[in-house]
């Protein structure tokens, strides 16, 4: 499985620091958690919390760790072999077609519809039509009503056709 990697995903080149472990590439590839040296002779470990690689690779740099945005919570930190896992905060979700941001979940449904499913970090609530024949909040008017100036004043019905 090969990930699509863009230049901006690559961490800035670093000289092999003493704490970075080296090993030899196997068939030109380095294991997860490492990248290959410029001369192709060594595998250099990624820096914990800064960069990572998830697969056997011949990358010159490890991939930069993602930082969770505001509105997201960090589920698990970045390790040398796995990127940070971020999740939308409670009450928000990430849509498949706009993964760049968390969106607010709806809090209710239009009248005549019912909520199915809860707000999760990956899905909004859904509102589905009540089955026909169910009572809608018990306020089915027999005839049209005139506007009342305040919600508390009873309406005076008059016969109107739509």
């Amino acid at each position: 499985e090969s990930a699509l990697i863009t230049q901006q995903d690559l961490a800035p080149q670093q000289r092999a620091a003493p704490q970075q472990k080296r090993s030899s590439p196997s068939e030109g590839l380095c294991p997860p958690g490492h990248h290959i040296s410029e001369d192709g002779r060594d595998c250099i470990s990624c820096k914990y919390g800064q960069d990572y690689s998830t697969h056997w690779n011949d990358l010159l740099f490890c991939l930069r760790c993602t930082r969770c945005d505001s509105g997201e919570v960090e589920l698990s930190p970045c390790t040398t072999t796995r990127n940070t896992v971020c999740q939308c905060e409670e009450g928000t979700f990430r849509e498949e077609d706009s993964p760049e941001m968390c969106r607010k979940c709806r809090t209710g449904c239009p009248r005549g519809m019912v909520k199915v499913g809860d707000c999760t970090p990956w899905s909004d609530i859904e509102c589905v039509h009540k089955e026909s024949g169910t009572k809608h909040s018990g306020e089915v008017p027999a005839v049209e009503e005139t506007v009342t100036s305040s919600p508390g004043t009873p309406a005076s019905p008059c016969s109107l056709s739509g």
Epitope: P110, R111, C127, H129, V140, E144, V147, G162
Partner: antibody
Framework: QVQLVQSGAEVKKPGASVKVSCKAS????????INWVRQATGQGLEWMGW????????GYAQKFQGRVTMTRNTSISTAYMELSSLRSEDTAVYYC??????????????WGQGTLVTVSS | DIQMTQSPSSLSASVGDRVTITCRAS??????LNWYQQKPGKAPKLLIY???SLQSGVPLRFSGSGSGTDFTLTISSLQPEDIATYYC?????????FGGGTKVEIK
């Protein structure tokens, strides 16, 4: 008879906000949700969201989430739709419509006359 | 989201002709399908709700049928005043969605 009367045409600059009003008469304002639907010139109808004038509860289409706010003033039976961070693609006729949820199926039974919002620099 | 596909996108017929417009939903929406008529420069007007119920005041030449995913609006005898664009709309699930419209013209 039932009527929804909207405010007049608006011309706005990109980045600005617009607030359209919709005054209801001929029925109990709080008994029916008000929805907003827009239509760009020569295009189809696009649902923006709904508002329950009784509870002030709202729900917006994800496309408009964060940019649209629907409110109401029950004392004057008026609903409002405010759209912010306007861009040229928001140039359209904006309609309010009454959502009739009584009976066998919900539908928009009455519509406002529409408000043309033009976004131009 | 539920996609609503209308066909044809436009049609031309003679006065007195029987005209049929179809609307297909991307998933089952039971009977929660409405039809609207929109004349140039005017707001849409409800014709049919719940797939087949005629809105009060709408001429009897308009009728609707269907359930599940396939729906039809029929004008039994086209009149000059029926020149308009017709839209279907599902009210089964939010976000509420409309078909792309069918423009009806007189030959």
């Amino acid at each position: 008879q039932v009527q929804l009367v909207q405010s007049g045409a608006e011309v706005k600059k990109p980045g600005a906000s617009v607030k359209v009003s919709c005054k209801a008469s001929g029925y109990t304002f709080t008994s029916y949700d008000i929805n907003w639907v827009r239509q760009a010139t020569g295009q189809g109808l696009e649902w923006m969201g709904w508002m329950n004038p009784n509870s002030d509860n709202t729900g917006y289409a994800q496309k408009f989430q964060g940019r649209v706010t629907m409110t109401r003033n029950t004392s004057i039976s008026t609903a409002y739709m405010e759209l912010s961070s306007l861009r040229s693609e928001d140039t359209a006729v904006y309609y309010c419509a009454r959502w009739n949820h009584y009976g066998s199926g919900s539908h928009f039974d009455y519509w406002g006359q529409g408000t043309l919002v033009t976004v131009s620099s | 989201d539920i996609q609503m596909t209308q066909s044809p996108s436009s049609l031309s017929a003679s006065v007195g002709d029987r005209v049929t417009i179809t609307c297909r939903a991307s998933q089952s929406i039971s009977i929660y399908l409405n039809w609207y008529q929109q004349k140039p420069g005017k707001a849409p007007k409800l014709l049919i709700y719940a797939a087949s119920s005629l809105q009060s005041g709408v001429p009897l030449r308009f009728s609707g049928s269907g359930s599940g995913t396939d729906f039809t609006l029929t004008i039994s005898s086209l009149q000059p005043e029926d020149i308009a664009t017709y839209y279907c709309q599902q009210s089964y699930k939010t976000p509420l969605t409309f078909g792309g419209g069918t423009k009806v013209e007189i030959k």
